[in-house]
Every structure is written in C-alpha cells, then in structure tokens.
Interface confidence: medium
C-alpha cells in the first residue's frame, strides 16, 4: 500500500505563438482545479476507461479575474498535494491522466459551471520510494508543469511497496535475518529473496523474485557473460563499463554449466550450481515440471506432472525463449516512421505519433501546421488534421500567397464606391449614407441612426473600414 | 575501471558540521547502493551510512542517526554526508564504498577515503 | 546490533604456511528463506582501503587468488590463507551485512 502524489507547480500559456485567451474574464470569474486518474501498466487505455490504480480531485483554486488587455497570465493554483491512494504492490509503470477544469463563478443559474480546460496524459515508469520526478506536458497552447512521486505507508518498503516491516521482537534489535526499517526505527526488515536460480555472484534483486544482472552478465538468471570484440585483457571482464569477457584458459571460462547454473573453480576442475530443476556435472539433467513453475512472464505450461515428462511453455505475446524469458524488443526495428515514438506494450506494438502524423505506424501525413507557414503575415491554425492559415488583410488563398481584392465581395451597401487601400478597403457612400460599410442611412433631419459621428467627419464622408 | 573520489574532509571544530562528497566514474552509479564506512586512526572499520539506488531508501547506525545524512544524486553519479552536529568521537577516515548489487549484498568496491578531524 | 568477534588478534606464519582466521557472530547471519549466510571478508594494507575477498561467506571475489577460501555457516566462519605470500600480510575483518552492518575488530597477519 501507498500514495501516489502529484504537486501542480504552474498552468498557463505555453511557449510560441498563438497565446491562448484567459479563461476568466471581469464578467466571468473562474478558479481551477485538477482531477488526475492513474492506471497500471502502459495502458492505452480511452480517457473514459476506469482509473483502476485510483483518482483524485483538488480542491478549488483562488478565484481569478482577467485583467483587461492583459495576457493570459500563469493561473492561481489550488493549494496541497493530489493524493491517489493505493492498496496493492505499485506497478512500477503507470499511465495518467490531469484534467484542468475551470469553475465558472458568475450568475449561472443552479450554481457554478464546470467546463474541461486541458487534458495531458502520459506512460511513465517509477519506483516508490525515490525522489520527485519532474514533468512538463502540452494540451494545445496550455502548459501544465508538475512533480509526481510514490511512496509506501508503513508497514510496506521497497520500490513496489511490496516488502513489509514487522514490529521487533525485542525493543533493542531485530531478530536474526532481519535488518531495521527505515525510516521505521522500531521495526524490522528481512532480506530479499532473489529469483530462484539468480546467480550469486553476477545477480541482485531489490524486489522479491527478481534477477537484476551486474554489468558484464546477462539471462535470465545472470549467468551468461557479455562478450565484446574489443576486450584488450586475456581473461576476465576488463572493465565495469564494457563488460568485456573473453575466454580463456579458466575452468570456468565460456560457462559450461547449461540452464543457468553457476559456475565456481575448484583446485582441479570445476563446479556446477544448478538451479532447482536440474542436475547433473553440468545441469544438463531437467527434472523439471509444470508444478515447479518454470514459465516466467504469465507463460502457460503444458506437460505432465510426473518427473518423466518435458514440459512446454506457451508466452504470451511479447516474450520468447524456452521459459518465457526473453522479452522481446519489438522496437529495436524502428517501426514507428516520422520520428514517432515506439511503445512495447507486451500484449501490443503501439506508434505514439508526432504532431502533424498519424496511423498505427505513423506513416500519414496529417499536412498540418508542423513545418509549414503561412505567407504574407498569416497564422497557421490547426484543427482536424488539416492546416488553415488565418491570412492577414488584403491576402488571401491556402497559404497567403494571393493578394485578396477586399472590394470584390461589394461590401459597400446602398451603391457605396469600394476603393482597395493598403489596410483593407475604404467605402464611399451615396449621398444619405454613411458608415464603415454605408450602412446606416442619413436621417431627413439631418440626425444620423447612429448615437454620434466621429469629431470632424461629415454624414456622406468615405469611412475607412479597418 | 571503478573509482570512487572522496572529498570533503578537513578540520572543525565539535558542533560543527561537513559534508563529504564521492564521485563515482566506471560503472553506472544509478544500479547500485552505496555506503560510507568510517575508520578511526589506529582502529577497525565502522559502517556509518547506506542509501540504496534510487535514493529512497536510507540507513543509519545507531552512533550517527539523527546527525548524519546520506544521500545521492544520480545525474551527477556522486554521492554525498551531511554531517552535523560532530564529536570528537567521529574523527576518522571516511570512505565511499559501492555494494555488489543493492542494499543486502556486500561492499566489493572503496574510495582512498577522505579524513575528517574533530578537535578544539 | 549483531556483535563480530575475530580470533586470534593477531597472528603470525611463515611463508608457504597455511594462515586461519576465525570469525564468531552473537546471532546467526544465516538467513533461512534463501540460505546464504550474510558474511564477507576483507584484506586491508596500511595506507590502503579495504580489499573485499570473500562474500556469502564463500563466494571468493573475482580477481583474488585462490588461495584464499571461506567456510562456515550459521555463526562460525573461518578465512583460511592456504599458503602464505609475502603480499598477504594485511589486518582481515569480516564483516555482517544481515542485520544492519557490523565488522570484527580486525586480525593482524604477520610474517613468522
């Protein structure tokens, strides 16, 4: 058991251009808040699906009012942690999901009005117990900036919160084979067991049942030497960094022990240490069967029970190899065109997509605003996979390129004369019009439907649209 | 090859406070805990701190919880004491040691050390 | 804390003798869901760090002679130099790495 904990450091408008508007306004106040769901595993899950790790809500932030003519600045947060509790092991990897949601205060009728401002999600891995991680996500032209980290409650330890501390047995020490806990000074932690078969010498585990391999060393069981071409030193790994290993005259050298078995020198030959299983000078002998459980990685073992009979292991997808052991790194071959990200999901091979492609392998191009720009002043904007440039006045055309003739739609009512001018057009209007357009008529009594005419302008003058 | 550089050492006085560095170079730092293991001048080896991998475990002995501090960070593959609120008692050499694997496996690699003097 | 006792402090042999090291723990390092005893042994040269030798007890370290072995389980271990070199004389410490971390005081291993 444990809390995931997420701290909203700033939310506003991201870098570039095309600033999005505040969303509050002096006749609209708002406050935000933050809603996050969090799912096992690299899920590519629907926004919809259920938040199977746990969700949670902020509570509301100050209540916030634009500044006319202003920016949208970085908004008022609420304040505290959003904390998503946990009852089982921490999965170590995890998909989610922050909305920012935006309260509107003003004069709704039955209360306030929440509307969905920005929505960022993202795969992560993270163990518990270690330090805040740092993020920085987009939606659109907002940025969410945040902390996340997990830690265990007491009793639970370790980078899944999978180890327990028990309270001592006596006040002044642990028993034997169990460690202090920290930071719980009156409680006790016992050692890992490692996977069964974990090579002593070239394995470790921080997680029950796990194998992690020292530099040098690889399989299963972390007993298979690294081997490169550029060891320089006649026997033994060279280095920490390379793992080089090269044979050589050692009874050991090459590992002849099969199936993962260790192996150790003695005076005149050597020794196999067998992983349960097997036996035999060199672990050749497999005594092994469905019962010993010997398909990692969920595999499906089928064969007998009795000592006698082989057994097979059915992986699922993602993984090969005899026992299930091999993950296998579907991404190593680039599948994802355009630069897009790969994502080995184990039940799936998923593309996630750069702005502007599209597809399962991200071999479509959305010809949209990446890369592209609009002539003459114009700005692109994007919206449904296809790039529209909002040209600037007097231009006009997919990109910009043609100058717009402003008059040829008539925009000049009651026979108004439209004249093209270098900032739009200018209309002069028949007599007994006047307006932008021409579109208010003059009054007989020489009071015009409009409150007042600009200081200097007479009714019949050509009114410059801008 | 694994290295392993102590600094930070020198004289303060008692109440005073220090802060040793380790850097680490040959092997990648963020795999493995890592302790400080102190020796007094003329006497035996006492383990003072551990941390494992990522950081978010520590341990302490008894004789230094409370004043000391270890921690990591793995971006600059160093290692680091903070150590306040000294006694003469913990004038020692004090040396960087790397585990085989994680917290629960032996110390296979250690620095030159650095010495720290406590005294009026 | 599990308290380390080594015997003899010191100890002298003579080149090409075999040298032995005993080690007693107040509490078993043996831990029984995996059944490795928790114990290493280190070489310390003056002016030096300490070297590690031997861990679970009688794991020897790679690169160290085999002249070098561990035995033992439970609380009693024993570091046994088969044939002794001019280069072996150092202080050796076991050392606990089961219930927080404890070391022996050091034995002194000297030339006869």
């Known amino acids: 058991a444990g809390v995931f904990e997420l701290q909203i450091h700033s939310f506003g408008p991201g870098p570039g251009p095309g600033a999005p508007r505040s969303p509050c306004s002096a006749r609209l106040p708002c406050r935000l808040f933050f809603r996050v769901c969090l799912k096992p595993g690299l899920s590519e899950e629907a926004a919809e699906s259920p938040c199977a790790l746990g969700a949670a809500l902020s509570a509301r932030g100050p209540v916030y009012t634009e500044q006319p003519g202003a920016p949208a600045p970085d908004l008022p947060l609420p304040d505290g942690l959003l904390q998503v509790p946990f009852r089982d092991a921490w999965p170590g990897t995890f998909s989610f999901i922050i909305e920012t949601w935006r309260e509107e205060l003003g004069d709704q009728i039955g209360g306030p009005a929440w509307s969905l401002l920005a929505r960022v999600a993202g795969r992560r891995r993270l163990a518990a117990g270690g330090p805040w991680a740092r993020d920085i996500q987009r939606a659109g032209a907002w940025e969410l900036r945040f902390s996340y980290r997990a830690r265990c409650e007491p009793p639970a330890v370790g980078t899944a919160c999978t180890r327990l501390c028990r309270p001592r047995s006596a006040p002044s020490r642990c028993g034997p084979g169990l460690r202090p806990c920290a930071p719980l000074e009156d409680e006790c932690e016992a050692p890992l067991v490692c996977r069964a078969g974990c090579s002593p010498e070239h394995g470790f585990c921080e997680q029950p049942g796990e194998c992690r391999c020292l530099e040098g060393w690889t399989g299963p069981l972390c007993t298979v030497p690294v081997s490169t071409s550029s060891c320089l030193s006649p026997r033994g790994p060279s280095s920490a960094t390379t793992g080089c290993l090269v044979p050589g005259p050692g009874p050991c050298d090459g590992n002849p022990c099969a199936n993962g078995g260790s192996c150790s020198e003695t005076p005149r030959s050597f020794e196999c240490t067998c992983p349960r299983g097997f036996y035999g000078l060199r672990c050749e002998v497999s005594g092994v069967t469905c019962a010993d459980g010997p398909c990692f990685n969920g595999g499906l073992c089928v064969g007998g029970a009795d000592p006698d009979s082989a057994y097979i292991c059915h992986c699922p997808p993602g993984f090969q190899g005899s026992n299930c052991e091999k993950r296998v790194d579907r991404c190593s071959l680039q599948p994802c065109r355009n630069g897009g990200l790969c994502l080995d999901l184990g039940h799936a091979l998923r593309c996630r997509c750069r702005a502007g492609f599209a597809g399962p392998r991200c071999e479509h191009d959305l010809d949209d605003c990446a890369g592209r720009a609009c002539a003459n002043g114009g700005t692109c904007v994007e919206g449904g996979g296809a790039h529209r440039c909002s040209c600037a006045l007097g231009f006009g055309g997919r990109d910009c390129r043609e100058r717009a003739d402003p008059c040829a739609a008539r925009p000049c009512a009651h026979g108004g004369r439209c004249y093209a001018h270098f900032s739009g057009l200018v209309c002069a209007c028949a007599p007994g019009y006047m307006g932008a357009r021409c579109e208010f008529p003059v009054h007989p009594d020489g009071a015009s439907a409009l409150p007042a005419a600009p200081p200097g302008l007479r009714p019949g003058d050509p009114q410059r649209y801008l | 090859e694994v290295q392993l550089l102590e600094s930070g050492g020198g004289l303060v006085q008692p109440g005073g406070s220090l802060r040793l560095s380790c850097a680490a170079s040959?092997?990648?730092?963020?795999?493995?805990?890592m302790s400080w293991v102190r020796q007094a001048p003329g006497k035996g080896l006492e383990w003072v701190a551990a941390?494992?991998?990522?950081?978010?475990?520590?341990y302490y002995a008894d004789s230094v919880k409370g004043r000391f501090t270890i921690s990591r960070d793995n971006s600059k593959n160093t290692l680091y004491l903070q150590m306040n609120s000294l006694r003469a008692e913990d004038t020692a050499v004090y040396y960087c040691?790397?585990?085989?694997?994680?917290?629960?496996?032996?110390?296979?690699?250690w620095g030159q050390g650095t010495l720290v003097t406590v005294s009026s | 804390d599990i308290v380390m006792t080594q015997s003899p402090d010191s100890l002298a042999v003579s080149l090409g003798e075999r040298a032995t090291i005993n080690c007693k723990s107040s509490?078993?390092?043996?831990?029984?869901?995996?059944?490795?005893?928790?114990l290493a042994w280190y070489q310390q040269k003056p002016g030096q760090p300490p070297k590690l030798l031997i861990y679970?007890?009688?794991t020897r370290e790679s690169g160290v002679p085999d002249r070098f072995s561990g035995s033992g389980s439970g609380t009693d271990f024993t570091l046994t130099i088969s044939s002794l070199q001019a280069e072996d004389v150092a202080v050796y410490y076991c050392?606990?790495?089961?219930?927080?971390?404890?070391f022996g005081q050091g034995t002194r291993l000297e030339i006869k």
């Open positions: 040959g092997f990648t730092f963020s795999s493995y805990a």
């Open positions: 941390i494992n991998s990522n950081g978010g475990n520590t």
């Open positions: 040691a790397r585990h085989r694997g994680g917290f629960y496996y032996a110390v296979d690699y």
């Open positions: 050392h606990q790495y089961l219930s927080s971390r404890t």
């Open positions: 679970w007890a009688s």
């Open positions: 509490q078993s390092v043996l831990y029984s869901s995996n059944q490795k005893n928790y």
